[in-house]
């Protein structure tokens, strides 16, 4: 004896998050009478997704006209998909009963899989900057995508890194995934104008990973060096000294001019001239009459940068020998000037 | 109102690959929901379903075929096609493909095409 | 598959004569049942469908009864143009299936 059977043909389908899913049904019979339902999931916590006989389902359209009398496809649309509709879906086949209609047969279900796309990765550094030779964190994150398997690298300047951890998020079943991974970067003085990348590749991108970047221009402090040298005279009975403030970044940089251990100027590092690999130098001069001093004067050039405890310089001028050059100025960079006379 | 036409070879070889195909006019093949069938008559005989496919794009095979039977369908051509592969000189036929439209019944059919196995 | 099994499997009539056809499915169909006529050299037609609904543009001399199990078809005058083979067809259950045919000549 002939008995209806319900046919769901795709074990599974897979969609694009946004998309439109088809999930196929067909009964080979219209005995007996009666309507069709879907489901989402089985059991008794199972979910209705649409319901032939009556309801509202603004999400859902039937593939074929249920009012034909002879029709047996029963194949649905579901609209605009999340990863939130994955599971797997039944078409079930009722009996007209009284007064309810009793459950008759069910298909063997259809497993619907969504594919989301990652999150436009976003890399984030340390929270306070540090100096070259020290080692680095950074975290790459990136969310809501489906399915589980991803691929994330990273890259400094174009060269990929090796030293990360790489988690996916949650290790069971679910809807949607998330990516976390940390590398560990190692700054060098060249590093201003680096970046590091996080590239992150996944089915639903067709080829083209999404990347999320960061400047280490953000994470790096080079300090400077300091050269404290006395220039040739400018006048009888007067002493030029300059501070080169070389190779420091970030621009922030305060520099005190002490005499004798006394403050004599204190300036904010403003026209500074950049080199190629993105740091900064600068200059400070001071304009020392010799003449109001009986002994020996100690100079020093004193300089706070981004905040990091001070660091300094000093230079011996003596009085009692006329003034004369100690040393020269090797800054080719010298654009900043500033005067300063002692009485 | 919707007319049907076979074409395709009139004359197979066995083991070969018969194939039809059945060209819809004056109405297009994915309105409505119909059914898209296949139906064959051996000389002198009655009539054989094949199969259909509707709108969803699922297609039910006659199990006395099913393996060697596909029906497709090319919306932008506005037709719907049958290959029977492996065929014998017991697929020697008349075939026929037939609409069957909102009420029951196949309303709609092709005039025939009669297709020869023979070496 | 559902067997449909049609009687007599040919008639001879004259003009003006009712003619009755039965066909007999194998298990119960309700009232899913269509019949066709079909003339020599020609594509089958659907007559009636559901069982007893007339076809669009089909002389009214045509009617089909019958539900469950066994189903009739009748010419109430037979007329020349008549001659033809016909077919009940089944689709209550797939595969579609039909009778074997009923060949009706005039006398």
């Known amino acids: 004896e002939e008995e209806l059977q319900v046919i769901q043909p795709d074990k599974s389908v897979l969609v694009a998050a946004g998309e439109t899913a088809t999930l196929r049904c067909t009964a080979t019979s219209l005995i007996p009478v009666g309507p069709i339902q879907w489901f989402r999931g089985a059991g008794p916590g199972r979910e209705l997704i649409y319901n032939q006989k009556e309801g509202h389902f603004p999400r859902v359209t039937t593939v074929s006209d249920l009012t034909k009398r002879n029709n047996m496809d029963f194949s649905i649309r579901i609209g605009n998909i999340t990863p939130a509709d994955a599971g797997t879906y039944y078409c079930v086949k009722f009996r007209k009963g009284s007064p309810d209609d009793v459950e008759f047969k069910s298909g063997a279900g259809t497993e619907l899989s969504v594919r989301a796309k990652p999150s436009a990765p976003v890399v984030s550094g340390p929270a306070a900057r540090a100096t070259p030779q020290h080692t680095v964190s950074f975290t790459c994150e990136s969310h809501g995508f489906s399915p589980r398997d991803i691929t994330l690298k990273w890259f400094k300047n174009g060269n990929e890194l090796s030293d990360f951890q790489t988690n996916v998020d949650p290790v069971g079943e679910s809807v949607s995934y998330s990516i976390h991974s940390t590398a560990k970067v190692v700054l060098t003085r060249e590093d201003v104008h680096s970046q590091v990348i996080c590239e992150v590749a996944h089915v639903t991108l067709q080829g083209d990973p999404l990347r999320g970047t960061a400047n280490l221009s953000e994470t790096i402090r080079v300090p400077p060096t300091l050269e404290v040298t006395q220039q040739p005279v400018r006048a009888e009975n007067q002493v030029n000294v300059t501070c080169q403030v070389r190779k420091f970044y970030p621009q922030r940089l305060q520099l005190t001019w002490l005499e004798n251990g006394n403050v004599s100027r204190t300036e904010t590092a403003s026209t500074v001239t950049e080199n190629k690999d993105g740091t900064y130098n600068w200059m400070s001069w001071l304009l020392v009459n010799v003449s109001a001093h009986r002994d020996d004067v100690k100079l020093t050039c004193q300089v706070e940068h981004d905040g990091q405890p001070a660091v300094s310089k000093s230079h011996d001028l003596k009085v009692s020998a006329h003034p004369k050059e100690q040393g020269s100025n090797t800054a080719a960079e010298n654009t900043g000037s500033n005067e300063r006379n002692i009485y | 109102q919707v007319q049907l036409q076979e074409s395709g070879p009139g004359l197979v070889k066995p083991s070969q690959t018969l194939s039809l195909t059945c060209t819809v006019s004056?109405?297009?093949?994915?309105?409505?929901?119909?059914?898209w069938s296949w139906i064959r008559q051996h000389p002198g005989k009655g009539l054989e379903w094949i199969g259909y496919?509707?709108?969803?794009?699922?297609?039910y095979y006659n199990p006395s075929l099913k393996s060697r039977v596909t029906i497709s369908v090319d919306t932008s051509k506005n037709q719907f096609s049958l290959k029977l592969s492996s065929v014998t000189a017991a697929d020697t036929a008349v075939y026929y493909c037939?609409?069957?439209?909102?009420?029951?019944?196949?309303?709609?059919w092709g005039q025939g095409t009669t297709v020869t196995v023979s070496s | 598959d559902i067997q449909m099994t049609q009687s007599p499997s040919s008639l001879s009539a004259s003009v003006g004569d009712r003619v009755t056809i039965t066909c007999q499915a194998s298990q119960d169909i309700s009232n899913y049942l269509n019949w066709y006529q079909q003339k020599p050299g020609k594509a089958p037609k659907l007559l009636i469908y559901d069982a007893s609904n007339l076809a669009t543009g089909v002389p009214s001399r045509f009617s089909g009864s019958g539900s469950g199990t066994d189903f009739t078809f009748t010419i109430s005058s037979l007329q020349p143009e008549d001659i033809a083979t016909y077919y009940c067809?089944?689709?209550?259950?797939?595969?579609?299936?039909f009778g074997g045919g009923t060949k009706v000549e005039i006398k």
């Open positions: 496919i509707y709108a969803s794009g699922f297609t």
């Open positions: 037939a609409r069957e439209g909102y009420h029951s019944g196949m309303d709609v």
């Open positions: 067809q089944q689709f209550a259950y797939l595969p579609w299936t």
């Open positions: 004056g109405g297009s093949i994915s309105s409505g929901s119909p059914y």
